[in-house]
């Protein structure tokens, strides 16, 4: 079950899925990827205030300890809970190949 | 395969497992946990410099985009890669029970 989906910092500022455009050059992929020329990277961005989308008990503990020891324990962090596959057309020695990567695009986010 | 386990920031400064001592009061558990009175919480703390313990391709992309768009894309974050179980003795209506929690203590860390 998802803990607190209401963002106390204002709409869009807490941990959520966000799309960032990147060129092959940005990613250092220009020498091995043919297509797409630009990638829509879905990633998890935003703050993780107390109990917002807490992934598990560890995240809840982290929130409590961050409040008590902010210099030692960082706040929970917004990271992917699951991924969507992504298809790239790659250069190969013999020509090109269609390759699917399962850990490239975030699908859903939580705080941990 | 683990990307770069050498920390460029100096020994112990990069993402790794730490143990933080916490009382039941610290965690807000005093009213439902009997034992232990103190918990040694293992958690993932430390910086995630370029490609250090990158969990997957998403983490590698995040590093590249953080370099290009630091205001939008945060650096990868140090989070648990796996957990160790922890047993708590809990208060119940009828007495006490032994409960195992699988997502409470970090066992291993990576950057994502």
């Amino acid at each position: 079950a998802r803990n607190g989906d209401h963002c106390p910092l204002g709409p869009g500022r807490c941990c959520r899925l966000h799309t960032v455009r990147a060129s092959l050059e940005d990613l250092g992929w220009a020498d091995w990827v043919l297509s797409p020329r630009e990638v829509q990277v879905t990633m998890c961005i935003g703050a993780c205030p107390s109990q917002f989308r807490a992934a598990n008990m560890h995240a809840q503990i982290k929130t409590s300890l961050h409040r008590l020891k902010p210099d030692t324990v960082p706040a929970p962090c917004c990271v992917p809970a699951s991924y969507n596959p992504m298809v790239l057309i790659q250069k190969t020695d013999t020509g090109v190949s269609l390759q699917t990567y399962d850990d490239l695009l975030a699908k859903d986010c939580h705080c941990i | 395969a683990r990307n770069g386990d050498h920390c460029p920031l100096g020994p112990g400064r990069c993402c790794r497992l730490h143990t933080v001592r916490a009382s039941l009061e610290d965690l807000g558990w005093a009213d439902w946990v009997l034992s232990p009175r103190e918990v040694q919480v293992t958690m993932c703390i430390g910086a995630c410099p370029s490609q250090f313990r990158a969990a997957n391709m998403h983490a590698q992309i995040k590093t590249s985009l953080h370099r290009l768009k630091p205001d939008t894309v945060p650096a990868p974050c140090c989070v648990p890669a796996s957990y160790n179980p922890m047993v708590l003795i809990q208060k119940t209506d009828t007495g006490v029970s032994l409960q195992t929690y699988d997502d409470l203590l970090a066992k291993d860390c990576h950057c994502i």
Partner: antibody, heavy 113, light 110 residues
């Protein structure tokens, strides 16, 4: 380039499928969107598909009436329960967020009794 | 879905003047905003992506700025050929956002 087809005059309630055909790039690696524009009105986003995974996103007003799907060479927009309010030019777009967003010329759908 | 508000439905400016069009997002979208120009009978043409990056072939008279929730398109040295309707679009894809367009601002060049 991209080109839409399938737009025509239909009566209310008739289902209709629009097709977007791409040339010059591989659909399987791009995000594709459908956008519509009623006569004399503004642009309205319908939804987006990532052809690589088939993952879809829709505007909240769509409410299951429209479905975006893909084949190896096309991106289709299946429309059901059409009303006169759905009369518009429907655009297929390679996007949303490419520095070289490509729009088709559009296909006109007229819903009238 | 996110709401994009273009405050002015229409603006009028003499040739050579400067036009400013504002777009406000109902939630924080970082730099995920594009600007389009549309002339009657034509599909929209991309001018600006990522809030401030100029699309290929677009004159440098067009400038995008802003971040978060407030965005602006500025056309300096406006020309007769700039008469068109301009739309902002959220280019973020997430369950809460979506690729909503603003209502459009018509630019009339006198």
């Amino acid at each position: 380039s991209v080109k839409e087809s399938g737009g025509r005059l239909v009566t209310p309630g008739t289902p209709l499928t629009l097709t977007c055909k791409a040339s010059g790039f591989s659909l399987s690696t791009y995000w594709m969107s459908w956008v519509r524009q009623a006569p004399g009105k503004g642009l309205e986003w319908i939804g987006t598909i990532y052809a690589g995974s088939g993952g879809t996103w829709y505007a909240s007003w769509v409410k299951g009436r429209f479905t975006i799907s893909k084949t190896s060479t096309t991106v289709d927009l299946k429309m059901t329960s059409l009303t006169t309010e759905d009369t518009a030019t429907y655009f297929c777009v390679r996007g949303p967020n490419y520095s070289d967003a490509i729009w088709g010329p559009g296909t006109l759908v007229t819903v009238s009794s | 879905d996110i709401v994009l508000t273009q405050t002015a439905a229409s603006v009028s400016e003499p040739v050579g003047g400067t036009v400013t069009i504002k777009c406000q997002a109902s939630e924080y979208i970082y730099s995920s905003l594009a600007w389009y120009q549309q002339k009657p009978g034509q599909p929209p043409k991309l001018l600006i992506y990522d809030a401030s990056d100029l699309a290929s072939g677009v004159p440098s008279r067009f400038k995008g700025s802003g971040y978060g929730t407030e965005f602006t398109l500025t056309i300096s040295g406006v020309q007769c050929g700039d008469a068109a309707t301009y739309y902002c679009q959220c280019t973020d894809l997430s369950s809460s956002a979506g690729n909503t367009f603003g209502g459009g601002t018509e630019v009339v060049v006198k």
